[in-house]
Protein backbone atom coordinates (compact mmCIF):
# COMPACT_ATOMS: atom_id res chain seq x y z
CA UNK A 1 0.00 0.00 0.00
CA UNK A 2 2.93 2.30 0.62
CA UNK A 3 3.71 2.06 -3.08
CA UNK A 4 0.50 3.98 -3.80
CA UNK A 5 1.33 6.56 -1.16
CA UNK A 6 4.80 7.28 -2.51
CA UNK A 7 3.94 7.52 -6.21
CA UNK A 8 2.96 11.17 -5.96
CA UNK A 9 5.37 12.02 -3.14
CA UNK A 10 4.66 12.42 0.54
CA UNK A 11 2.77 15.67 0.04
CA UNK A 12 0.26 14.28 -2.43
CA UNK A 13 -0.25 10.53 -1.88
CA UNK A 14 -2.75 8.55 -3.89
CA UNK A 15 -5.98 8.14 -1.99
CA UNK A 16 -8.52 5.57 -3.17
CA UNK A 17 -10.85 2.92 -1.83
CA UNK A 18 -13.10 0.20 -3.23
CA UNK A 19 -15.10 -1.93 -0.82
CA UNK A 20 -17.38 -4.91 -1.26
CA UNK A 21 -20.97 -5.32 -0.10
CA UNK A 22 -21.72 -7.43 2.93
CA UNK A 23 -25.09 -8.90 3.84
CA UNK A 24 -26.32 -7.61 7.16
CA UNK A 25 -28.98 -8.67 9.63
CA UNK A 26 -29.28 -5.09 10.83
CA UNK A 27 -32.57 -3.36 10.12
CA UNK A 28 -30.87 -0.21 8.86
CA UNK A 29 -31.20 1.17 5.34
CA UNK A 30 -27.47 1.98 5.26
CA UNK A 31 -25.54 -0.66 3.30
CA UNK A 32 -22.69 -2.56 4.93
CA UNK A 33 -19.27 -3.00 3.30
CA UNK A 34 -16.11 -5.00 3.88
CA UNK A 35 -12.44 -5.04 2.92
CA UNK A 36 -12.65 -8.46 1.30
CA UNK A 37 -12.21 -10.01 -2.13
CA UNK A 38 -10.52 -7.71 -4.62
CA UNK A 39 -10.84 -4.57 -2.51
CA UNK A 40 -8.72 -1.41 -2.49
CA UNK A 41 -7.63 0.68 0.49
CA UNK A 42 -4.70 2.82 -0.58
CA UNK A 43 -3.53 4.00 2.84
CA UNK A 44 -4.86 5.34 6.13
CA UNK A 45 -5.99 8.62 4.57
CA UNK A 46 -9.24 6.85 3.72
CA UNK A 47 -10.84 4.32 6.08
CA UNK A 48 -13.91 2.13 6.25
CA UNK A 49 -15.63 2.91 9.54
CA UNK A 50 -18.17 0.65 11.24
CA UNK A 51 -18.46 -1.25 7.97
CA UNK A 52 -20.73 1.44 6.60
CA UNK A 53 -18.92 4.67 5.71
CA UNK A 54 -15.79 5.73 3.89
CA UNK A 55 -14.11 8.52 5.84
CA UNK A 56 -11.38 10.78 4.47
CA UNK A 57 -8.68 12.63 6.38
CA UNK A 58 -7.78 15.22 3.73
CA UNK A 59 -9.85 17.99 2.19
CA UNK A 60 -10.16 17.93 -1.56
CA UNK A 61 -12.07 16.85 -4.61
CA UNK A 62 -13.05 13.19 -4.76
CA UNK A 63 -14.77 11.12 -7.40
CA UNK A 64 -17.17 8.98 -5.39
CA UNK A 65 -19.12 6.05 -6.81
CA UNK A 66 -21.41 3.22 -5.83
CA UNK A 67 -22.98 0.32 -7.63
CA UNK A 68 -25.97 -1.53 -6.28
CA UNK A 69 -27.56 -4.61 -7.82
CA UNK A 70 -30.92 -5.61 -6.40
CA UNK A 71 -33.67 -8.14 -7.05
CA UNK A 72 -37.27 -7.10 -6.56
CA UNK A 73 -40.79 -7.84 -7.69
CA UNK A 74 -43.55 -5.31 -8.28
CA UNK A 75 -46.21 -7.28 -6.44
CA UNK A 76 -44.06 -8.14 -3.44
CA UNK A 77 -42.63 -4.61 -3.04
CA UNK A 78 -44.13 -1.30 -2.06
CA UNK A 79 -45.38 0.86 -4.90
CA UNK A 80 -42.41 3.19 -4.44
CA UNK A 81 -39.36 2.43 -6.61
CA UNK A 82 -36.09 1.03 -5.33
CA UNK A 83 -33.87 4.05 -4.59
CA UNK A 84 -30.14 4.05 -3.90
CA UNK A 85 -28.66 7.22 -2.42
CA UNK A 86 -25.06 8.31 -2.01
CA UNK A 87 -24.96 10.44 1.12
CA UNK A 88 -22.48 12.72 2.87
CA UNK A 89 -21.91 13.43 6.55
CA UNK A 90 -19.45 16.24 7.22
CA UNK A 91 -18.33 17.16 10.74
CA UNK A 92 -20.76 19.65 12.26
CA UNK A 93 -23.16 19.36 9.31
CA UNK A 94 -26.36 17.47 8.71
CA UNK A 95 -26.32 14.41 6.47
CA UNK A 96 -27.14 15.25 2.88
CA UNK A 97 -27.89 13.40 -0.35
CA UNK A 98 -25.23 13.74 -3.04
CA UNK A 99 -26.64 11.38 -5.67
CA UNK A 100 -29.71 9.19 -6.10
CA UNK A 101 -30.94 6.67 -8.61
CA UNK A 102 -34.34 5.07 -8.85
CA UNK A 103 -35.57 1.93 -10.57
CA UNK A 104 -39.14 0.70 -10.71
CA UNK A 105 -39.53 -2.91 -9.53
CA UNK A 106 -39.56 -5.69 -12.11
CA UNK A 107 -42.56 -7.85 -12.91
CA UNK A 108 -40.29 -10.90 -13.17
CA UNK A 109 -40.85 -13.68 -10.62
CA UNK A 110 -39.74 -14.41 -7.99
CA UNK A 111 -37.78 -11.18 -8.55
CA UNK A 112 -36.00 -9.37 -11.36
CA UNK A 113 -32.44 -8.16 -11.01
CA UNK A 114 -31.45 -4.60 -11.86
CA UNK A 115 -28.25 -2.62 -11.38
CA UNK A 116 -27.78 1.01 -10.43
CA UNK A 117 -24.57 3.01 -10.80
CA UNK A 118 -23.94 6.35 -9.11
CA UNK A 119 -20.88 8.57 -9.45
CA UNK A 120 -19.80 12.18 -9.18
CA UNK A 121 -17.13 14.68 -8.15
CA UNK A 122 -17.54 16.31 -4.75
CA UNK A 123 -15.47 18.31 -2.33
CA UNK A 124 -14.97 16.57 0.98
CA UNK A 125 -13.76 18.16 4.22
CA UNK A 126 -11.34 16.45 6.61
CA UNK A 127 -13.31 13.84 8.57
CA UNK A 128 -16.15 13.74 6.04
CA UNK A 129 -17.87 10.39 5.56
CA UNK A 130 -19.83 9.04 2.61
CA UNK A 131 -22.25 6.16 2.74
CA UNK A 132 -24.93 4.41 0.70
CA UNK A 133 -28.57 4.18 1.64
CA UNK A 134 -31.25 2.04 -0.04
CA UNK A 135 -34.99 1.70 0.32
CA UNK A 136 -34.82 -2.04 1.02
CA UNK A 137 -31.45 -3.63 1.92
CA UNK A 138 -32.98 -7.13 1.85
CA UNK A 139 -33.31 -6.81 -1.94
CA UNK A 140 -29.60 -6.09 -2.51
CA UNK A 141 -27.51 -8.73 -4.35
CA UNK A 142 -24.23 -9.65 -2.67
CA UNK A 143 -22.84 -12.09 -5.23
CA UNK A 144 -19.27 -11.47 -6.43
CA UNK A 145 -18.95 -8.03 -8.00
CA UNK A 146 -22.62 -7.04 -7.90
CA UNK A 147 -22.56 -4.32 -5.25
CA UNK A 148 -19.58 -2.08 -4.42
CA UNK A 149 -18.62 1.37 -3.25
CA UNK A 150 -15.53 3.51 -3.62
CA UNK A 151 -13.79 6.79 -4.15
CA UNK A 152 -10.61 8.32 -5.48
CA UNK A 153 -9.01 11.66 -4.68
CA UNK A 154 -8.31 13.82 -7.70
CA UNK B 1 -0.50 11.38 -27.86
CA UNK B 2 2.88 12.51 -26.58
CA UNK B 3 1.17 15.56 -25.13
CA UNK B 4 -0.65 13.27 -22.68
CA UNK B 5 2.56 11.46 -21.83
CA UNK B 6 4.54 14.59 -21.06
CA UNK B 7 1.96 16.44 -18.96
CA UNK B 8 2.98 14.70 -15.77
CA UNK B 9 6.64 14.25 -16.71
CA UNK B 10 8.37 11.16 -18.03
CA UNK B 11 8.20 9.37 -14.69
CA UNK B 12 4.45 9.65 -14.33
CA UNK B 13 2.78 9.84 -17.74
CA UNK B 14 -0.98 9.96 -18.12
CA UNK B 15 -2.35 6.51 -18.87
CA UNK B 16 -5.89 6.18 -20.18
CA UNK B 17 -7.94 4.30 -22.75
CA UNK B 18 -11.47 4.35 -24.11
CA UNK B 19 -12.42 1.83 -26.78
CA UNK B 20 -15.56 1.27 -28.80
CA UNK B 21 -17.59 -1.92 -29.14
CA UNK B 22 -17.32 -4.01 -32.26
CA UNK B 23 -19.79 -6.62 -33.45
CA UNK B 24 -18.22 -10.05 -33.68
CA UNK B 25 -19.14 -13.32 -35.33
CA UNK B 26 -17.09 -15.22 -32.75
CA UNK B 27 -19.02 -17.47 -30.39
CA UNK B 28 -17.23 -16.12 -27.33
CA UNK B 29 -18.90 -14.30 -24.45
CA UNK B 30 -16.00 -11.82 -24.30
CA UNK B 31 -16.88 -8.51 -25.97
CA UNK B 32 -14.76 -7.20 -28.84
CA UNK B 33 -13.48 -3.62 -29.00
CA UNK B 34 -11.79 -1.33 -31.50
CA UNK B 35 -9.77 1.87 -31.63
CA UNK B 36 -12.30 3.64 -33.82
CA UNK B 37 -14.58 6.65 -33.62
CA UNK B 38 -13.81 8.98 -30.72
CA UNK B 39 -11.51 6.56 -28.94
CA UNK B 40 -8.65 7.25 -26.52
CA UNK B 41 -5.30 5.48 -26.27
CA UNK B 42 -2.94 7.73 -24.34
CA UNK B 43 0.33 5.94 -25.09
CA UNK B 44 1.84 2.46 -25.28
CA UNK B 45 1.55 1.94 -21.52
CA UNK B 46 -1.97 0.68 -22.17
CA UNK B 47 -2.83 -1.42 -25.21
CA UNK B 48 -5.84 -3.13 -26.73
CA UNK B 49 -4.85 -6.75 -27.33
CA UNK B 50 -6.63 -9.14 -29.70
CA UNK B 51 -9.48 -6.64 -29.79
CA UNK B 52 -10.73 -7.92 -26.46
CA UNK B 53 -8.57 -6.87 -23.51
CA UNK B 54 -6.95 -3.70 -22.22
CA UNK B 55 -3.48 -4.55 -20.96
CA UNK B 56 -1.37 -2.26 -18.78
CA UNK B 57 2.40 -2.13 -18.46
CA UNK B 58 2.65 -0.34 -15.11
CA UNK B 59 1.51 -1.39 -11.66
CA UNK B 60 -0.85 0.97 -9.91
CA UNK B 61 -4.39 1.99 -9.12
CA UNK B 62 -6.74 2.30 -12.08
CA UNK B 63 -10.34 3.41 -12.40
CA UNK B 64 -11.80 0.89 -14.84
CA UNK B 65 -15.25 1.21 -16.40
CA UNK B 66 -17.51 -0.35 -18.98
CA UNK B 67 -20.87 0.50 -20.42
CA UNK B 68 -23.01 -2.08 -22.19
CA UNK B 69 -26.32 -1.39 -23.91
CA UNK B 70 -28.30 -4.46 -24.91
CA UNK B 71 -31.68 -5.32 -26.39
CA UNK B 72 -33.48 -8.41 -25.15
CA UNK B 73 -36.93 -9.90 -24.72
CA UNK B 74 -38.11 -12.03 -21.81
CA UNK B 75 -39.79 -14.65 -23.98
CA UNK B 76 -36.93 -14.99 -26.45
CA UNK B 77 -34.19 -15.13 -23.79
CA UNK B 78 -33.25 -17.64 -21.12
CA UNK B 79 -34.81 -17.06 -17.72
CA UNK B 80 -31.46 -15.88 -16.37
CA UNK B 81 -30.90 -12.10 -16.50
CA UNK B 82 -28.48 -10.36 -18.83
CA UNK B 83 -25.21 -10.05 -16.89
CA UNK B 84 -22.19 -7.93 -17.81
CA UNK B 85 -18.95 -8.68 -15.97
CA UNK B 86 -15.74 -6.69 -15.78
CA UNK B 87 -12.98 -9.27 -15.39
CA UNK B 88 -9.26 -9.30 -14.65
CA UNK B 89 -6.48 -11.60 -15.83
CA UNK B 90 -3.15 -11.03 -14.10
CA UNK B 91 0.00 -12.95 -15.09
CA UNK B 92 0.15 -16.22 -13.19
CA UNK B 93 -3.30 -15.70 -11.69
CA UNK B 94 -6.73 -16.97 -12.58
CA UNK B 95 -9.25 -14.75 -14.31
CA UNK B 96 -11.52 -13.15 -11.75
CA UNK B 97 -14.63 -11.03 -11.69
CA UNK B 98 -14.12 -7.44 -10.53
CA UNK B 99 -17.61 -6.05 -11.14
CA UNK B 100 -20.94 -7.36 -12.37
CA UNK B 101 -24.31 -5.90 -13.21
CA UNK B 102 -27.53 -7.74 -13.97
CA UNK B 103 -30.72 -6.66 -15.69
CA UNK B 104 -33.83 -8.75 -16.15
CA UNK B 105 -34.97 -8.95 -19.76
CA UNK B 106 -37.64 -6.57 -20.99
CA UNK B 107 -41.15 -7.58 -22.03
CA UNK B 108 -41.00 -5.11 -24.94
CA UNK B 109 -41.12 -6.57 -28.45
CA UNK B 110 -39.16 -7.41 -30.48
CA UNK B 111 -36.74 -6.42 -27.71
CA UNK B 112 -36.29 -3.72 -25.11
CA UNK B 113 -33.08 -1.77 -24.76
CA UNK B 114 -31.34 -1.34 -21.41
CA UNK B 115 -27.97 0.08 -20.41
CA UNK B 116 -25.53 -1.12 -17.77
CA UNK B 117 -22.63 0.89 -16.36
CA UNK B 118 -19.80 -0.62 -14.33
CA UNK B 119 -16.87 1.18 -12.73
CA UNK B 120 -14.41 0.87 -9.87
CA UNK B 121 -10.87 1.43 -8.59
CA UNK B 122 -8.54 -1.57 -8.68
CA UNK B 123 -4.85 -2.28 -8.39
CA UNK B 124 -3.38 -3.77 -11.54
CA UNK B 125 -0.02 -5.53 -11.85
CA UNK B 126 2.30 -5.07 -14.85
CA UNK B 127 0.91 -7.17 -17.72
CA UNK B 128 -2.57 -7.37 -16.21
CA UNK B 129 -5.49 -7.41 -18.62
CA UNK B 130 -9.10 -6.38 -18.10
CA UNK B 131 -12.00 -7.45 -20.28
CA UNK B 132 -15.78 -7.52 -20.44
CA UNK B 133 -17.88 -10.66 -20.50
CA UNK B 134 -21.62 -10.85 -21.15
CA UNK B 135 -24.20 -13.61 -21.04
CA UNK B 136 -25.30 -13.07 -24.65
CA UNK B 137 -23.10 -10.97 -26.98
CA UNK B 138 -25.72 -11.14 -29.76
CA UNK B 139 -27.96 -8.87 -27.67
CA UNK B 140 -25.38 -6.08 -27.35
CA UNK B 141 -26.09 -2.75 -29.11
CA UNK B 142 -23.22 -1.41 -31.21
CA UNK B 143 -24.73 1.89 -32.36
CA UNK B 144 -22.63 5.02 -31.80
CA UNK B 145 -21.81 5.50 -28.13
CA UNK B 146 -23.94 2.67 -26.75
CA UNK B 147 -21.22 0.25 -25.64
CA UNK B 148 -17.70 1.22 -24.55
CA UNK B 149 -14.87 0.27 -22.23
CA UNK B 150 -11.98 2.13 -20.68
CA UNK B 151 -9.64 2.93 -17.84
CA UNK B 152 -7.50 5.67 -16.39
CA UNK B 153 -4.49 5.40 -14.09
CA UNK B 154 -4.77 7.42 -10.90
CA UNK C 1 -11.73 27.13 -4.89
CA UNK C 2 -8.16 28.34 -5.15
CA UNK C 3 -7.20 25.50 -2.86
CA UNK C 4 -8.05 23.05 -5.67
CA UNK C 5 -6.08 25.11 -8.14
CA UNK C 6 -2.95 25.24 -6.04
CA UNK C 7 -2.78 21.58 -5.04
CA UNK C 8 -1.00 20.55 -8.19
CA UNK C 9 0.82 23.86 -8.69
CA UNK C 10 -0.01 26.70 -11.06
CA UNK C 11 1.00 24.70 -14.11
CA UNK C 12 -1.33 21.80 -13.44
CA UNK C 13 -4.38 22.92 -11.44
CA UNK C 14 -7.19 20.55 -10.60
CA UNK C 15 -10.06 20.93 -13.02
CA UNK C 16 -13.43 19.45 -12.16
CA UNK C 17 -17.13 20.23 -12.28
CA UNK C 18 -20.37 18.71 -11.06
CA UNK C 19 -23.63 20.45 -11.85
CA UNK C 20 -27.23 19.79 -10.92
CA UNK C 21 -30.23 19.37 -13.21
CA UNK C 22 -32.70 22.20 -13.60
CA UNK C 23 -36.24 21.90 -14.91
CA UNK C 24 -36.74 23.96 -18.04
CA UNK C 25 -39.73 25.22 -19.98
CA UNK C 26 -37.64 25.27 -23.15
CA UNK C 27 -38.65 22.84 -25.85
CA UNK C 28 -35.07 21.70 -26.43
CA UNK C 29 -33.80 18.19 -25.92
CA UNK C 30 -30.61 19.52 -24.32
CA UNK C 31 -30.76 19.28 -20.54
CA UNK C 32 -30.33 22.37 -18.38
CA UNK C 33 -27.96 22.52 -15.40
CA UNK C 34 -27.21 24.86 -12.53
CA UNK C 35 -24.51 25.59 -9.98
CA UNK C 36 -26.75 24.89 -7.02
CA UNK C 37 -26.97 22.45 -4.15
CA UNK C 38 -23.80 20.48 -3.57
CA UNK C 39 -22.18 21.44 -6.87
CA UNK C 40 -18.50 21.61 -7.85
CA UNK C 41 -16.76 24.18 -10.03
CA UNK C 42 -13.05 23.98 -9.32
CA UNK C 43 -11.95 27.20 -11.07
CA UNK C 44 -12.47 29.18 -14.26
CA UNK C 45 -10.76 26.53 -16.39
CA UNK C 46 -14.15 24.84 -16.63
CA UNK C 47 -17.38 26.80 -16.91
CA UNK C 48 -21.10 26.16 -17.23
CA UNK C 49 -22.30 28.10 -20.26
CA UNK C 50 -25.93 29.03 -20.95
CA UNK C 51 -26.91 26.53 -18.29
CA UNK C 52 -26.44 23.70 -20.76
CA UNK C 53 -22.81 22.95 -21.53
CA UNK C 54 -19.56 22.45 -19.65
CA UNK C 55 -16.76 24.20 -21.50
CA UNK C 56 -13.06 23.64 -20.86
CA UNK C 57 -10.17 26.00 -21.48
CA UNK C 58 -7.34 23.46 -21.52
CA UNK C 59 -6.63 20.58 -23.85
CA UNK C 60 -6.30 17.19 -22.26
CA UNK C 61 -7.91 13.97 -21.17
CA UNK C 62 -11.11 14.28 -19.17
CA UNK C 63 -13.34 11.75 -17.49
CA UNK C 64 -16.85 12.99 -18.32
CA UNK C 65 -20.02 11.60 -16.78
CA UNK C 66 -23.74 12.16 -16.58
CA UNK C 67 -26.57 10.61 -14.66
CA UNK C 68 -30.18 10.94 -15.74
CA UNK C 69 -33.18 9.65 -13.84
CA UNK C 70 -36.47 9.68 -15.72
CA UNK C 71 -40.04 8.55 -15.25
CA UNK C 72 -41.94 7.19 -18.23
CA UNK C 73 -44.75 4.86 -19.20
CA UNK C 74 -44.84 2.55 -22.20
CA UNK C 75 -48.38 3.49 -23.22
CA UNK C 76 -47.93 7.23 -22.81
CA UNK C 77 -44.54 7.35 -24.60
CA UNK C 78 -43.45 6.78 -28.17
CA UNK C 79 -42.38 3.24 -29.01
CA UNK C 80 -38.75 4.39 -29.12
CA UNK C 81 -36.81 3.97 -25.86
CA UNK C 82 -35.66 6.82 -23.65
CA UNK C 83 -32.14 7.70 -24.79
CA UNK C 84 -29.63 9.91 -23.00
CA UNK C 85 -26.62 11.09 -25.00
CA UNK C 86 -23.39 12.72 -23.90
CA UNK C 87 -22.34 14.98 -26.74
CA UNK C 88 -19.28 17.04 -27.71
CA UNK C 89 -18.98 20.32 -29.59
CA UNK C 90 -15.40 21.27 -30.41
CA UNK C 91 -14.53 24.61 -32.05
CA UNK C 92 -14.80 24.32 -35.82
CA UNK C 93 -16.21 20.79 -35.62
CA UNK C 94 -19.68 19.31 -35.86
CA UNK C 95 -21.39 18.12 -32.71
CA UNK C 96 -20.81 14.43 -32.07
CA UNK C 97 -22.12 11.75 -29.75
CA UNK C 98 -19.57 10.45 -27.22
CA UNK C 99 -21.80 8.12 -25.20
CA UNK C 100 -25.41 6.96 -25.24
CA UNK C 101 -27.62 4.84 -23.04
CA UNK C 102 -31.10 3.55 -23.77
CA UNK C 103 -33.87 2.26 -21.54
CA UNK C 104 -37.21 0.91 -22.65
CA UNK C 105 -40.16 2.62 -20.96
CA UNK C 106 -41.72 1.03 -17.90
CA UNK C 107 -45.20 -0.46 -17.77
CA UNK C 108 -45.69 1.04 -14.28
CA UNK C 109 -48.39 3.67 -13.93
CA UNK C 110 -48.52 6.61 -13.99
CA UNK C 111 -44.83 6.18 -14.80
CA UNK C 112 -41.88 4.08 -13.74
CA UNK C 113 -38.58 5.63 -12.70
CA UNK C 114 -35.27 4.46 -14.16
CA UNK C 115 -31.72 5.79 -13.92
CA UNK C 116 -29.02 5.95 -16.56
CA UNK C 117 -25.33 6.52 -15.92
CA UNK C 118 -22.84 7.48 -18.63
CA UNK C 119 -19.09 7.97 -18.26
CA UNK C 120 -15.87 7.81 -20.24
CA UNK C 121 -12.41 9.24 -20.91
CA UNK C 122 -12.12 11.63 -23.83
CA UNK C 123 -9.65 14.15 -25.15
CA UNK C 124 -11.05 17.66 -25.21
CA UNK C 125 -9.60 20.62 -27.13
CA UNK C 126 -9.45 24.15 -25.69
CA UNK C 127 -12.92 25.65 -25.96
CA UNK C 128 -14.62 22.26 -26.30
CA UNK C 129 -18.07 21.90 -24.76
CA UNK C 130 -19.92 18.81 -23.59
CA UNK C 131 -23.65 18.58 -23.06
CA UNK C 132 -26.42 16.05 -22.43
CA UNK C 133 -29.29 15.37 -24.77
CA UNK C 134 -32.39 13.27 -24.05
CA UNK C 135 -35.32 12.06 -26.10
CA UNK C 136 -37.90 13.62 -23.79
CA UNK C 137 -36.78 16.24 -21.22
CA UNK C 138 -40.25 16.35 -19.68
CA UNK C 139 -39.67 12.83 -18.30
CA UNK C 140 -36.48 13.75 -16.45
CA UNK C 141 -36.54 13.67 -12.62
CA UNK C 142 -35.13 16.77 -10.93
CA UNK C 143 -35.41 15.70 -7.29
CA UNK C 144 -32.28 16.04 -5.16
CA UNK C 145 -29.42 13.99 -6.58
CA UNK C 146 -31.37 12.27 -9.34
CA UNK C 147 -29.87 13.96 -12.39
CA UNK C 148 -26.36 15.42 -12.61
CA UNK C 149 -23.46 16.05 -14.97
CA UNK C 150 -19.75 16.54 -14.50
CA UNK C 151 -16.15 16.05 -15.49
CA UNK C 152 -12.65 15.89 -14.13
CA UNK C 153 -9.34 16.47 -15.87
CA UNK C 154 -6.86 13.63 -15.55
Amino acid sequence: ENSFEMQKGDQNPQIAAHVISEASSKTTSVLQWAEKGYYTMSNNLVTLENGKQLTVKRQGLYYIYAQVTFCSNREASSQAPFIASLCLKSPGRFERILLRAANTHSSAKPCGQQSIHLGGVFELQPGASVFVNVTDPSQVSHGTGFTSFGLLKL
Amino acid sequence: ENSFEMQKGDQNPQIAAHVISEASSKTTSVLQWAEKGYYTMSNNLVTLENGKQLTVKRQGLYYIYAQVTFCSNREASSQAPFIASLCLKSPGRFERILLRAANTHSSAKPCGQQSIHLGGVFELQPGASVFVNVTDPSQVSHGTGFTSFGLLKL
Amino acid sequence: ENSFEMQKGDQNPQIAAHVISEASSKTTSVLQWAEKGYYTMSNNLVTLENGKQLTVKRQGLYYIYAQVTFCSNREASSQAPFIASLCLKSPGRFERILLRAANTHSSAKPCGQQSIHLGGVFELQPGASVFVNVTDPSQVSHGTGFTSFGLLKL
Epitope: G37 | K89, F94, E95, F131 | -
Partner: nanobody
Framework: EVQLVESGGGLVQAGGSLRLSCAAS????????MAWFRQAPGKEREFVAA????????DYSDSLKDRFTISRDNAKATLYLRMNNLKPEDTAVYYC??????????????????????WGQGTLVTVSS
Amino acid sequence: EVQLVESGGGLVQAGGSLRLSCAASGRTPLNYHMAWFRQAPGKEREFVAAISSLLGSTDYSDSLKDRFTISRDNAKATLYLRMNNLKPEDTAVYYCAARETTHYSTSDRVNEMRSYDYWGQGTLVTVSS
Protein backbone atom coordinates in the same frame (compact mmCIF):
# COMPACT_ATOMS: atom_id res chain seq x y z
CA GLU D 1 -18.74 -31.96 -12.33
CA VAL D 2 -16.28 -32.50 -15.18
CA GLN D 3 -14.42 -35.66 -16.17
CA LEU D 4 -10.95 -35.37 -17.75
CA VAL D 5 -9.26 -38.04 -19.89
CA GLU D 6 -5.70 -37.55 -21.16
CA SER D 7 -4.23 -39.18 -24.26
CA GLY D 8 -1.30 -38.83 -26.66
CA GLY D 9 1.50 -40.00 -24.39
CA GLY D 10 4.08 -42.57 -25.41
CA LEU D 11 7.73 -43.16 -26.19
CA VAL D 12 9.59 -40.54 -28.18
CA GLN D 13 13.23 -39.87 -28.95
CA ALA D 14 15.03 -36.83 -27.59
CA GLY D 15 14.50 -33.84 -29.90
CA GLY D 16 11.13 -35.19 -31.00
CA SER D 17 7.63 -33.79 -30.53
CA LEU D 18 4.34 -34.93 -29.03
CA ARG D 19 0.84 -33.50 -28.72
CA LEU D 20 -1.12 -34.45 -25.64
CA SER D 21 -4.90 -34.16 -25.53
CA CYS D 22 -7.33 -33.89 -22.64
CA ALA D 23 -10.99 -34.54 -23.40
CA ALA D 24 -13.44 -32.91 -21.00
CA SER D 25 -16.95 -34.20 -20.49
CA GLY D 26 -19.75 -33.35 -18.12
CA ARG D 27 -20.63 -29.70 -17.55
CA THR D 28 -19.54 -27.24 -20.23
CA PRO D 29 -15.73 -26.94 -20.15
CA LEU D 30 -16.09 -23.38 -21.40
CA ASN D 31 -16.57 -22.50 -17.74
CA TYR D 32 -13.27 -24.01 -16.63
CA HIS D 33 -9.70 -22.85 -16.33
CA MET D 34 -7.52 -25.69 -17.61
CA ALA D 35 -3.91 -26.66 -16.94
CA TRP D 36 -1.24 -29.28 -17.43
CA PHE D 37 0.93 -30.57 -14.61
CA ARG D 38 3.55 -33.34 -14.71
CA GLN D 39 5.12 -35.72 -12.25
CA ALA D 40 8.51 -37.29 -12.96
CA PRO D 41 9.45 -40.55 -11.22
CA GLY D 42 10.33 -39.91 -7.60
CA LYS D 43 9.52 -36.19 -7.82
CA GLU D 44 6.63 -33.93 -6.85
CA ARG D 45 3.96 -32.92 -9.33
CA GLU D 46 4.89 -29.62 -11.02
CA PHE D 47 3.09 -26.98 -13.06
CA VAL D 48 3.57 -26.98 -16.83
CA ALA D 49 1.05 -24.54 -18.37
CA ALA D 50 -2.44 -23.10 -17.94
CA ILE D 51 -5.05 -21.51 -20.16
CA SER D 52 -7.86 -19.26 -18.95
CA SER D 53 -11.50 -19.99 -19.61
CA LEU D 54 -12.66 -16.71 -21.12
CA LEU D 55 -9.72 -14.94 -22.73
CA GLY D 56 -7.71 -18.06 -23.50
CA SER D 57 -4.71 -16.35 -21.88
CA THR D 58 -1.78 -18.65 -21.27
CA ASP D 59 0.70 -19.02 -18.41
CA TYR D 60 3.77 -21.27 -18.52
CA SER D 61 6.46 -22.61 -16.27
CA ASP D 62 9.46 -20.37 -16.99
CA SER D 63 11.65 -23.36 -17.83
CA LEU D 64 9.22 -24.81 -20.37
CA LYS D 65 7.63 -21.83 -22.16
CA ASP D 66 10.05 -21.90 -25.12
CA ARG D 67 9.25 -25.51 -26.00
CA PHE D 68 5.68 -26.18 -24.84
CA THR D 69 2.41 -24.66 -26.08
CA ILE D 70 -0.98 -25.02 -24.42
CA SER D 71 -4.21 -24.53 -26.39
CA ARG D 72 -7.87 -25.45 -26.22
CA ASP D 73 -10.65 -26.20 -28.67
CA ASN D 74 -13.88 -25.25 -26.96
CA ALA D 75 -16.02 -26.76 -29.71
CA LYS D 76 -14.40 -30.13 -29.09
CA ALA D 77 -14.10 -29.58 -25.33
CA THR D 78 -10.44 -30.54 -25.59
CA LEU D 79 -7.24 -29.20 -24.08
CA TYR D 80 -3.90 -29.69 -25.84
CA LEU D 81 -0.22 -29.55 -24.97
CA ARG D 82 2.24 -29.36 -27.85
CA MET D 83 5.74 -30.39 -26.73
CA ASN D 84 8.73 -29.73 -28.99
CA ASN D 85 12.44 -30.55 -28.71
CA LEU D 86 11.73 -33.06 -25.97
CA LYS D 87 14.47 -33.97 -23.51
CA PRO D 88 14.95 -37.04 -21.29
CA GLU D 89 14.15 -34.88 -18.25
CA ASP D 90 10.66 -34.30 -19.71
CA THR D 91 9.86 -37.94 -18.92
CA ALA D 92 6.85 -37.87 -16.60
CA VAL D 93 3.18 -38.58 -16.20
CA TYR D 94 1.29 -35.57 -17.57
CA TYR D 95 -1.95 -34.61 -15.86
CA CYS D 96 -4.79 -32.43 -17.04
CA ALA D 97 -6.47 -30.25 -14.39
CA ALA D 98 -9.55 -28.03 -14.30
CA ARG D 99 -11.05 -25.37 -12.06
CA GLU D 100 -14.42 -23.69 -12.29
CA THR D 101 -14.31 -20.07 -13.41
CA THR D 102 -16.54 -19.00 -10.54
CA HIS D 103 -14.47 -20.84 -7.93
CA TYR D 104 -12.78 -18.58 -5.39
CA SER D 105 -10.49 -20.79 -3.32
CA THR D 106 -7.67 -19.81 -1.02
CA SER D 107 -5.33 -19.98 -3.99
CA ASP D 108 -5.48 -17.54 -6.85
CA ARG D 109 -2.33 -18.83 -8.56
CA VAL D 110 -2.46 -20.95 -11.69
CA ASN D 111 0.71 -22.88 -10.82
CA GLU D 112 -0.51 -24.37 -7.54
CA MET D 113 -2.04 -27.85 -7.45
CA ARG D 114 -4.48 -26.87 -4.73
CA SER D 115 -6.06 -24.35 -7.08
CA TYR D 116 -7.70 -27.09 -9.16
CA ASP D 117 -10.88 -29.04 -8.47
CA TYR D 118 -10.67 -31.82 -11.08
CA TRP D 119 -7.85 -34.05 -12.30
CA GLY D 120 -7.39 -36.65 -14.98
CA GLN D 121 -5.65 -40.01 -14.48
CA GLY D 122 -2.57 -38.92 -16.46
CA THR D 123 -0.73 -40.05 -19.58
CA LEU D 124 2.88 -41.27 -19.52
CA VAL D 125 5.49 -39.56 -21.71
CA THR D 126 8.87 -41.26 -21.98
CA VAL D 127 11.74 -39.50 -23.74
CA SER D 128 14.69 -41.73 -24.62
CA SER D 129 18.16 -40.42 -25.28
